[in-house]
Structure formats: structure tokens, C-alpha cells
């Protein structure tokens, strides 16, 4: 598997992973004790035919071209969790692994 | 997890799974011995904010609103394999479980 990595200076127009730091404090999400911020990343860019297609299915749908099927879009294809310490709304503080919080790779799906 | 199912008569505009039969013969893909065709399904529709979002990350990116980030798009969130019998290009015929060939659920990601 393969995915492009870009930054704010990149001129890449194709589907790419960009850095993004999520700041819970800035959101006013004060029920999250830790981390205050984390590197989440995000996906952006164009999905030309076949470029970075994660699934053979994507290619097959393109071939079959059914009514209303949009082209593939740039979306996370690999994600990872982060550990968080947070209030759970029942006056409890929980430490847990929250899945799919970080984008590790982007692709066309 | 939850996803909408639609058909060609549906008036649903939101992200939905639609039926699609992929016919390898129609594609001229004669290296595939079996199956000749299979039910692949596909995803189509609009992703209004928060509707069918698969990941908390999707919501966070929307909040952070970085440059160039598109809204979430309607994409497979659960897929399954099919067994295929095919020529592998080295004069061998292989039976294998090919991953991510069938869309079981669609969501906004």
C-alpha cells in the first residue's frame, strides 16, 4: 500500500495526506483531559482514474459505471488510534484507546 | 454501525448502498474463470454534516476546517471478500480470497 504525503507548501493536486493538529482546547472540548492536542492529519486532493485506488472494487465500479456513482474520493485508507483521558459524562474519568483518530494514509475509494 | 440501503427506485439523496452486479465477461476480463459475475454494490449520495460519519476524525477535521479539506464523501465503510479462480499471468491458475470486492455498508468519511 502506498499514499502521498504533502504539506501546506505542496503543489500536489492529487489525493494526499496533509498535516493537521487538532486542538481540543480550541474547540472548547474541556471534557478531554489529555491530550490537549494531537496530530490527526487529513486527506485532500483529486482522484484521477486508478490513482491510489485502495480497492479493486473501485476500479470495477468505474468500469460498470452505474447511475449516480460518483468517481472515487480522497479518503483515509489507514487510520490509527490514540490514547485519551476523558470525562465520560457519568462523572467518571476514563483512559481509553480511541480508534481511527489519526490518518496514516490516504487513498481513492 | 449503520448504513442505508437503496435501489434504483429510491428517492434517497443521502449516502446509500446501491446494488450493482459486476460482469467480468462484459469487461472482457477472461483471465477470471469464476465467478463470471458477482454482486459488488456501490456507494452514492450526499454526506450532510454528521450523517453516517464512520470516524470521530471526520467530525474533528470538519471542526478544524483546514485549507483544502473537502466535506466527507460517501464511501464503503465495510467490505467483504469473494473467492475467485483466475489465471495469475504465469501460466498458473489460482483460487484466492480477494479482499474488499463487495460493499456491505456505506458511510461518510
Amino acid at each position: 500500500d502506498f499514499g502521498l504525503d504533502c504539506d501546506e507548501h505542496s503543489t500536489e493536486s492529487r489525493c494526499c495526506r496533509y498535516p493537521l493538529t487538532v486542538d481540543f482546547e480550541a474547540f472548547g472540548w474541556d471534557w478531554i483531559i489529555a491530550p490537549k492536542r494531537y496530530k490527526a492529519n487529513y486527506c485532500s486532493g483529486e482522484c484521477e482514474f486508478v490513482f491510489l485506488q485502495k480497492y479493486p472494487h473501485t476500479h470495477l465500479v468505474h468500469q460498470a459505471n452505474p447511475r449516480g456513482s460518483a468517481g472515487p474520493c480522497c479518503t483515509p485508507t489507514k487510520m490509527s488510534p490514540i490514547n485519551m483521558l476523558y470525562f465520560n459524562g457519568k462523572e467518571q474519568i476514563i483512559y481509553g484507546k480511541i480508534p481511527a483518530m489519526v490518518v496514516d494514509r490516504c487513498g481513492c475509494s | 454501525d449503520f448504513g442505508l440501503d437503496c435501489d434504483e427506485h429510491s428517492t434517497e439523496s443521502r449516502c446509500c448502498r446501491y446494488p450493482l452486479t459486476v460482469d467480468f465477461e462484459a469487461f472482457g476480463w477472461d483471465w477470471i474463470i469464476a465467478p463470471k459475475r458477482y454482486k459488488a454494490n456501490y456507494c452514492s449520495g450526499e454526506c450532510e454534516f454528521v450523517f453516517l460519519q464512520k470516524y470521530p476524525h471526520t467530525h474533528l477535521v470538519h471542526q478544524a476546517n483546514p485549507r483544502g479539506s473537502a466535506g466527507p464523501c460517501c464511501t464503503p465503510t465495510k467490505m467483504s471478500p469473494i473467492n475467485m479462480l483466475y489465471f495469475n499471468g504465469k501460466e498458473q491458475i489460482i483460487y484466492g480470497k480477494i479482499p474488499a470486492m463487495v460493499v456491505d455498508r456505506c458511510g461518510c468519511s
Epitope: - | 465477461e25 477472461d30 474463470i33 473467492n83 498458473q92 491458475i93 489460482i94 483460487y95
Partner: antibody, heavy 116, light 107 residues
Amino acid sequence: EVQLLESGGGLVQPGGSLRLSCAASGFTFSSYAMSWVRQAPGKGLEWVSTISSSGSYTSYPDSVKGRFTISRDNSKNTLYLQMNSLRAEDTAVYYCAKQDYAMNYWGQGTLVTVSS
Amino acid sequence: DIQMTQSPSSLSASVGDRVTITCKASQDVSTAVAWYQQKPGKAPKLLIYSASYRYTGVPSRFSGSGSGTDFTLTISSLQPEDFATYYCQQHYSTPWTFGGGTKVEIK
């Protein structure tokens, strides 16, 4: 009704050649891969060759590779097996079969005897 | 090449009996095993493919199971027309190979 009819078998000397044919009817021949399987007298089954639906891809076991050639003519709904450099151990009934995940329909076979 | 070892090589049974034939592959073949029935002087007929899928028109008394290396063909209640030789075949990778056969005879 699916029908497969093999022909072209007979007695041939070691080192000789023979071309088997399999006439297909009752299904869309050009849509299916096809195979040849053989069975020596009183013995079990042995896969001989498979060809893709358009004829672009073929596969053989080592025992016949370089000596046997599978081919097809979709306009005539016919499958072929060209057998060269025949040996005594090639003596068998040769069956053609319609191929899916497995061989789902077989012809009645044609006997090839390699003997001097 | 993948070896397919079938057992028993022959068995005697009566009409109505439950019959089980086994096939062992020399390596993992996933679910890529087919079973055929052959009567003397006739072509083989497909019974089961992909380990457990009954082919069109095959009576429900025939069933297949297994995955990996161990596979079974079961005839739940033997009928007079079931006396024949049965072969397993792996369709996992070429060269495709067959078991040696199991001859089911009348007791």
C-alpha cells in the same frame, strides 16, 4: 442441454502426434474456460490443460508441458488438444470439461492408445 | 504439487447407510476442493465444489465440508444409484490434482 463430444482418439505410435477435438453445444461456449482431463485404463483422473474463455491464457502440468497444446475456436464452438511426442504413459481416455470453480460438465471421452 | 490423499480406497455399504469419504491435502488449500462421482464406463459428474457448495441438480443427501487440509464428502442415506467411485480434487492452484478415488460397493 449441455453437450460435449470428444473425437480424434485412436492408436498412435510412440513419438507420434494426435489432435483431439471437443464439440460443444447447449451453452455459450465463448463465455467459459475449458479443460482437458485424462484417465489411464483402470486408474484415477489427471488434469491435462485449461484454456481461458477467449483463448488468451493457458495452463499445463509439467507432465505434458511443451508436448501438448490446448486451443479453441469460439466461432466453431470447438476445443482442441494437439498432442505431440506421445509416450506410452499418455495412453488414456481424454475428457473435455466445461470449467467453472470446478469442472462442472464432462464429455464422454475419447480413447488414445500409444503403442508400437 | 499438492497431493490429495483419499480414504478409504474402497468401502462396502448398504442402501440407507450414512457414508463418509475423507480427503487430506498435503498443504492448505483453503476451501478449494471439489468432489466427483464416476460410474464404470462413464464420465465423472460434479457433486460438490469449493468444499461445500452442492452443484445444480445434485441430491441433498450429498454434502461436503472442510477447509484447510481436511475435507469430507458425506452421503446421508445411500441410494442404489450412488454405488460408484468418488474422487476429490483440489482447485486451489495448478497443477490441479485428484485423490486416488474411493469405490463404494454394495455390501
